[in-house]
């Protein structure tokens, strides 16, 4: 009696169980009663990453430099090429099909986490006691200057965008 289901890494065709082609190979011809499944390796710019019965291999992804992409990991006959972004850019999606510039943290905000090829800059507000006076993708909030450790006094209070201004202590007149 012809089978209705096949083992793992097999497929049913013409009431017969044929072996699937291994990753990195495509199907040329199905098996018969007398012959095995015929498979052929994918060409250099192609891949198949599963046991399959595909008659065509998939093209490797192209990391388009015009979109700010570069190759992070070259594809093989069994794996696709992995793209990432050029320095100063990060992917717009998980599949990394295009890149955008890293965001800068505005004055009053500092960098909490520096951007990578796959994630944007994470900014945080400078809390009381800290400031950032620049727009930057790298600068963190800095603590206000401690006037008293320099034997000075605060002449102008700090904000989240400006440091305190220190000055000499007022000398008591005799």
């Amino acid at each position: 009696e012809p089978p209705t289901a096949c083992r793992e890494k097999q497929y049913l065709i013409n009431s017969q169980c044929c072996s699937l082609c291994q990753p990195g190979q495509k199907l040329v011809s199905d098996c018969t009663e007398f012959t095995e499944t015929e498979c052929l390796p994918c060409s250099e710019s192609e891949f198949l990453d599963t046991w399959n019965r595909e008659t065509r291999c998939h093209q490797h992804k192209y990391c388009d430099p015009n979109l700010g992409l570069r190759v992070q990991q070259k594809g093989t006959s069994e794996t696709d090429t992995i793209c990432t972004c050029e320095e100063g850019l990060h992917c717009t999606s998980e599949s990394c099909e295009s890149c955008v510039p890293h965001r800068s943290c505005l004055p009053g905000f500092g960098v909490k986490q520096i951007a990578t090829g796959v994630s944007d800059t994470i900014c945080e507000p400078c809390p009381v006691g800290f400031f950032s006076n620049v727009s930057s993708a790298f600068e963190k909030c800095r603590p206000w200057t401690s006037c008293e450790t320099k034997d000075l006094v605060v002449q102008q209070a700090g904000t989240n965008k400006t440091d305190v201004v220190c000055g000499p202590q007022d000398r008591q007149r005799a």
């Epitope: 945080e124 507000p125 809390p127 790298f138 963190k140 206000w144 200057t145």
Partner: antibody, heavy 116, light 111 residues
Framework: EVQLQQSGPELVKPGASMKISCKAS????????MNWVKQSHGKKLEWIGL????????SYNQKFKDKATLTVDKSSSTAYMELLSLTTEDSAVYYC?????????WGQGTTLTVSG | DIVLTQSPTSLAVFLGQRATISCRAS??????????MHWYQQKPGQSPKPLIY???NLESGVPARFSGSGSGTDFTLNIHPVEEEDAATYYC?????????FGGGTKLEIK
């Protein structure tokens, strides 16, 4: 990746002073703010103070102003906390921790035991 | 100094259920659209691990079952569904002003 490596456990006598170190790696030391935190009997966390490695500026919790002195050595990317006139109340785990709002990276902690 | 009061001090929750931890500040820690409250997890013999910053933002690498909410003086950490590995002590901390202060901690036990 930011890593903070602290000096090992210490057993000291009451009245003595001691210095804990915290060596930073994986980032530009001068750009980050180093905090120190005390944890007594495995529970209560207390912020001791912070130091700006860029210029050595410090800010202390008033409670620890006469107890702790914070310094840095930029050349070795190391922060130090010296604890003065130790008593049994100072027995605790001390952490260095980097951050401005929350403390995103912590050292492994240094256990200090003050016992006569 | 701002005093942070956590409740409950300990909590036992069934695997897969929700754990809710509260943190109340003695004065508002919110200003200019930001709430300067943060949460940590600490397991015995380990350093505190940051979970949530600025009330509701997940630190990178922290599972989405952790969430934070609140503003002004009242803040909440939720864990749902709770997993075995979540057994730990949880702390809140503010950065509204210096000195920074921490809550007294909430010990979470998984049943």
């Amino acid at each position: 990746e930011v890593q903070l490596q602290q000096s090992g456990p210490e057993l000291v006598k009451p009245g003595a002073s001691m210095k804990i170190s915290c060596k930073a790696s994986g980032y530009s030391f001068a750009d980050y703010t180093m905090n120190w935190v005390k944890q007594s009997h495995g529970k209560k966390l207390e912020w001791i103070g912070l130091i700006n490695p860029y210029n050595g500026g410090t800010s202390y919790n008033q409670k620890f102003k006469d107890k702790a002195t914070l310094t840095v050595d930029k050349s070795s990317s190391t922060a130090y906390m010296e604890l003065l006139s130790l008593t049994t109340e100072d027995s605790a785990v001390y952490y260095c921790a980097e951050g401005v709002n929350n403390f995103a990276d912590w050292g492994q902690g240094t256990t200090l035991t003050v016992s006569g | 100094d701002i005093v942070l009061t956590q409740s409950p001090t300990s909590l036992a929750v069934f695997l897969g259920q929700r754990a809710t931890i509260s943190c109340r500040a003695s004065k508002s820690v919110s200003t200019s659209g930001y709430s300067y409250m943060h949460w940590y997890q600490q397991k015995p013999g380990q350093s505190p691990k940051p979970l949530i910053y600025l009330a509701s933002n997940l630190e990178s690498g922290v599972p989405a079952r952790f969430s934070g909410s609140g503003s002004g003086t009242d803040f909440t950490l939720n864990i749902h569904p709770v997993e075995e590995e979540d057994a730990a002590t949880y702390y809140c901390q503010h950065s509204r002003e210096l000195p920074r202060t921490f809550g007294g901690g909430t010990k979470l036990e998984i049943k």
